[in-house]
Amino acid sequence: VPLSRTVRCTCISISNQPVNPRSLEKLEIIPASQFCPRVEIIATMKKKGEKRCLNPESKAIKNLLKAVSKERSKRSP
């Protein structure tokens, strides 16, 4: 569950469970910075634009990221 960028890190909770890529509107990877010392992965869902925070250390999430980037590279010319 993310917040506005005015606070330090964005996420309230992080999940080890991957989201369904078909339910996904957008996947953001926010690198560590002076505002937040850790990488944050924010999934924006199609329904209500709900945002979910994913655990970058989770194996399942790493697999999701691979699948999404594979899908994107297929689509790009």
Partner: antibody, heavy 119, light 111 residues
Framework: QVQLVESGGGVVQPGRSLRLSCAAS????????IHWVRQAPGKGLEWVAV????????FYADSVKGRFTISRDNSKNTLYLQMNSLRAEDTAVYYC????????????WGQGTLVTVSS | NFMLTQPHSVSESPGKTVTISCTGS????????VQWYQQRPGSSPTTVIY?????PSGVPDRFSGSIDSSSNSASLTISGLKTEDEADYYC??????????FGGGTKLTVL
């Protein structure tokens, strides 16, 4: 199985302080945002505060802002609520509750601890 | 500030259907998800509906949730009422995330 056990409640005089604890087990505490919710005797639920999984973000209800402080120790799987300048209207059962892993609802609640503010 | 208003109490006979409303003011109720919590006397709350209309595992399909944008309200419907359904029910949403808002609660009496 998931367990949340609150402690630290009791009778305290107005203006004094009290610290509540919530011991967690059965889930990855360091991944979970945790809330405090209270319930005055015979009344409804009132949200008090939330802390992010890593302790970097804290948010409070207007009614407790500046008086209550939420914190956590992930090495001890424990959540805290430091309550200062207590008022009679803070008398309530205080529950800690965890956010569901992948969503925005409270899937587990503690049994609650009663705080009575009275002279 | 976003607020949620519920009827103080409702009552119905066993086997019947009851609907508890939760009306939003100060904002659109369909902007965020709505949850419903059940609290039996002397117990902690438990979730019966999350994300508007989803049931956690273990909650019977007699419980259903819906949103009506035109009336800016959410509803919890319990069909085939049982005496064990007698409890207080609270709706909850956000103002905005992560600030939580609860409705005042509705006492359900199963006659």
């Amino acid at each position: 199985q998931v367990q949340l056990v609150e402690s630290g409640g009791g009778v305290v005089q107005p203006g004094r302080s009290l610290r509540l604890s919530c011991a967690a087990s059965g889930f990855t505490f360091s991944n979970s945002g945790i809330h405090w919710v209270r319930q005055a005797p015979g009344k409804g639920l009132e949200w008090v505060a939330v802390i992010s999984y890593d302790g970097s973000n804290k948010f409070y209800a207007d009614s407790v802002k500046g008086r209550f402080t939420i914190s956590r120790d992930n090495s001890k799987n424990t959540l805290y609520l430091q309550m200062n300048s207590l008022r009679a209207e803070d008398t309530a059962v205080y529950y800690c509750a965890k956010l569901r892993d992948n969503g925005e609802y409270l899937d587990y609640w503690g049994q609650g601890t009663l705080v009575t503010v009275s002279s | 500030n976003f607020m949620l208003t519920q009827p103080h109490s409702v009552s119905e006979s066993p086997g019947k259907t009851v609907t508890i409303s939760c009306t939003g003011s100060g904002g659109s109720i369909d902007r965020n998800y709505v949850q419903w919590y059940q609290q039996r006397p002397g117990s902690s709350p438990t979730t019966v509906i999350y994300e508007d209309n989803q049931r956690p595992s273990g909650v019977p399909d007699r419980f259903s949730g819906s949103i009506d944008s035109s009336s800016n309200s959410a509803s919890l419907t319990i069909s085939g009422l049982k005496t064990e359904d007698e409890a207080d029910y609270y709706c909850q949403s956000y103002d905005p995330l992560p600030v939580w808002v609860f409705g005042g609660g509705t006492k359900l009496t199963v006659l």
